[in-house]
Interface confidence: low
């Protein structure tokens, strides 16, 4: 099938990094500078993505693959493929419509992006809180209260009524 197709369509012989040039009797021409073709048999090459402004180049464009961008320091990628950049927040914060806000009590965020998430509820696993949570860190669960020596106490934080960070922002 491939051989038959090749006889019928000379363009199918053009490899990635080239295009089938109609202006030159359908011979395979290399992609011009700042363009690429990631598959064979292409009739045109695609323009390379340019990482400008708040974007910076993570991977240079080649004749067979597009450039990849990430964000300058203080910003992080949003959306699949880093189609845009948004400001970082500090650990212990989340980005809201009004900018960076501290995580509510009972929640944490250990990254510069993303949402505040509830502390683990140790009691759900029959365990006790070994180390209390903070805005930046989850609680550390320890052995179950029954395993503790007599007189030892544990603190289990109240579970938030609803998972935060899910308001539409």
């Amino acid at each position: 099938f491939e051989r038959t197709r090749s006889l019928q369509d000379p363009c199918s012989n053009c490899p990635a990094g080239t295009f089938c040039d109609n202006n030159r009797n359908q011979i395979c021409s290399p992609c011009p500078p700042n363009s690429f073709s990631s598959a064979g048999g292409q009739r045109t090459c695609d323009i390379c993505r340019q990482c400008k402004g708040v974007f910076r180049t993570r991977k240079e464009c080649s004749s067979t693959s597009n450039a990849e961008c990430d964000c300058t320091p203080g910003f992080h990628c949003l959306g699949a493929g880093c189609s845009m950049c948004e400001q970082d927040c500090k650990q212990g914060q989340e980005l809201t419509k009004k900018g960076c806000k501290d995580c509510c009590f009972g929640t944490f965020n250990d990254q510069k992006r993303g949402i505040c998430r509830p502390w683990t509820n140790c009691s759900l696993d029959g365990k006790s809180v070994l180390v209390n949570g903070t805005k930046e860190r989850d609680v550390v669960c320890g052995p179950s209260p029954a395993d503790l020596s007599p007189g030892a106490s544990s603190v289990t934080p109240p579970a938030p009524a609803r998972e935060p960070g899910h308001s539409p922002q």
Epitope: L78, G79, M84, E86, R113, G165, P168
Partner: antibody, heavy 119, light 107 residues
């Protein structure tokens, strides 16, 4: 390369259910929201809801509440949208699209899944 | 639900023309508005978010403006590839709602 690949076209009878899948590649679905948007023939776009694949939490448009269920399988980077009690008005192309933890950034879309409801 | 009223529903224009599409929200949505372009048989494509922030790769002829309840998408000099249907989307509150669409046709 970022991709959302949806399951194939479906033809269903009124009252039946349909489950459409959306398999992601090239990014971590737990870093994003996945939204579902539908488009009836010759009509505009209609947001159905979204799922946070990290937690499994979903928000649905009131119009679909009780009929739609969005689930995910993080091990296969696949999100599902099930719509039950189908009626002819549900005939549409259903799209999955990536959002983001903070904004409705639907910047990559699946190819769409055609669902036809006909007796 | 927040209603998004888009106008005009269709517009005929020529290559090189300046075109303006408006979107009016039934209540203030701050800057939580994005614009999409859709061509027949294809999935929509995000052009602009937060009213005026262009997605990387969107040509400079596209621009967005507005705040509160009134928003505008402007194409400064129409190119052949711009003929498509355009939708606005509010994402201040659930359910997110799209405008009815503006079909941009060749005159």
């Amino acid at each position: 390369q970022v991709q959302l690949v949806q399951s194939g076209a479906e033809v269903k009878k009124p009252g039946a259910s349909v489950k459409v899948s959306c398999k992601a590649s090239g990014f971590n679905i737990q870093d994003t929201y996945i939204h579902w948007v539908r488009q009836a023939p010759g009509q505009g776009l209609e947001w159905m809801g979204r799922i946070d694949p990290a937690s499994g939490n979903s928000e649905y448009a009131q119009k679909f509440q009780g009929r739609v269920t969005m689930t995910r399988d993080t091990s296969t980077s696949t999100v599902y949208m099930e719509l039950s009690s189908l009626r002819s008005e549900d005939t549409a192309v259903y799209y999955c699209t990536t959002g983001n933890l903070h904004y409705a950034l639907m910047d990559y879309w699946g190819q769409g899944t055609s669902v036809t409801v006909s007796s | 639900d927040i209603q998004m009223t888009q106008s005009p529903s269709s517009v005929s224009a020529s290559v090189g023309d300046r075109v303006t599409i408006t979107c009016k929200a039934s209540q203030p949505i701050n800057t939580y508005l994005s614009w999409y372009q859709q061509k027949p048989g294809k999935a929509p494509k995000l052009l602009i978010y937060r009213v005026n922030r262009k997605v990387d790769g969107v040509p400079s002829r596209f621009s967005g403006s507005g705040s509160g309840t009134d928003f505008t998408l402007t194409i400064s000099s129409l190119q052949p590839e711009d003929f498509a249907t355009y939708y606005c989307l509010q994402y201040l509150d659930f359910p997110y709602t799209f405008g009815g669409g503006t079909k941009l046709e060749i005159k």
